[in-house]
Amino acid sequence: EVEKTACPSGKKAREIDESLIFYKKWELEACVDAALLATQMDRVNAIPFTYEQLDVLKHKLDELYPQGYPESVIQHLGYLFLKMSPEDIRKWNVTSLETLKALLEVNKGHEMSPQVATLIDRFVKGRGQLDKDTLDTLTAFYPGYLCSLSPEELSSVPPSSIWAVRPQDLDTCDPRQLDVLYPKARLAFQNMNGSEYFVKIQSFLGGAPTEDLKALSQQNVSMDLATFMKLRTDAVLPLTVAEVQKLLGPHVEGLKAEERHRPVRDWILRQRQDDLDTLGLGLQG
């Protein structure tokens, strides 16, 4: 807590500029008007303040806005955002995507901090759903963002937002999350033709039911083994040998290398040996 002291003569700040870096903490407290700071927040980032000095500036803003900062200030926080606690951020009402981007930019290259997580949560809740532009922004900064959400949170993602999802955004999703995302993806991409559809839906297939896998086998997709290995075991088990053969196309030979791993192992055990023999791969049920 900085002690209340009078500002020395001639030191009263008329604007936020580089001269302030030479102010001691108590001088910043006494000589910088909080309202001036709020209107000139965009200048703060251009000035190499020390962490201690930033603490003082934050304190001044906290006093001016005890109920939470207005968005006009939040948008220009810059590195001062790193000083905010999740409790501070919970008081904010962030509605502009530009504000969100500006703050994420400050944290770029780092793990998602509790502050960032709180900010995103506030922003998404304020919007009511995870729209495409928001998802685009969040996954650009944090590719694992989508998979950090619970199935319940993912249920608020509208199908139109799925267009923003890249394959790498789903790398860490578990089956329960893909179960929620897959039907949205199917809806989002339903008007695409066969080959284009498969390219888009491929990374979501870990949530696909048996019927959809059977249907995919009718589209000459030639699914690779890496994708096949990520399918739900319960969805793969009812597939016939002919359907797997059609689904994988030339990649069917890769089943041999995966015969001891799920879901291939469990699928093999479910097939008649006569049927497996027709693949000519030496698979033993």
């Epitope: 019927e211 059977k214 249907a215 000459n220 009812p238 016939t240």
Partner: antibody, heavy 117, light 107 residues
Framework: EVQLVESGGGLVQPGGSLRLSCAAS????????MSWVRQAPGKGLEWVAT????????YYPDSVKGRFTISRDNSKNTLYLQMNSLRAEDTAVYYC??????????WGQGTLVTVSS | DIQMTQSPSSLSASVGDRVTITCRAS??????LNWYQQKPGKAPKLLIY???RLHSGVPSRFSGSGSGTDFTLTISSLQPEDFATYYC?????????FGQGTKVEIK
Amino acid sequence: EVQLVESGGGLVQPGGSLRLSCAASGYTFSDYFMSWVRQAPGKGLEWVATISNGGTYTYYPDSVKGRFTISRDNSKNTLYLQMNSLRAEDTAVYYCARFDGYIFDYWGQGTLVTVSS
Amino acid sequence: DIQMTQSPSSLSASVGDRVTITCRASQDISNYLNWYQQKPGKAPKLLIYYTSRLHSGVPSRFSGSGSGTDFTLTISSLQPEDFATYYCQQGNTLPYTFGQGTKVEIK
């Protein structure tokens, strides 16, 4: 043993409608796609429609698209073909067949549909 | 659509003869080629699928070969019950199409 038994064929006027049924037994009906294939008198085989195991997906050739509708009731182990706006060239024996990936592996005995005035 | 052309349209042969029927696809269908046998007044029956795999219960005198666009059905030693019409069918691409049929008659 897989058994497929078609019914519902008969004589119908051009422009008329008919619904064919196919009762399946001897296997788990809901595990397989099903199809209809027809054969005009003295002619070859023509695929008419396919439906996915749960009924979500349907496939048709251009010759019947918009006129024929394939459906199924898995609780009754029954496949259907609703044929509307029938034409003389739709006259054929209609077979229901189990469809496995790319193979029509089991066929019914067929039911004759005659479209004539 | 993929056109399937069988030849010959019909042939006459004797019991014990080796019979060969060919089927040509208008474009590459990989090995998704099936053969069916149909006797007069009866439903077709699957004989061979995926070019060369025998369906259950089909005698080993039937065999298939080929890939891409050209395929062959061979009956190594024709039996009285083999006199029928044979159809090829491609299962590579929708719409699935059949050849026009080859009728095998008694000489």
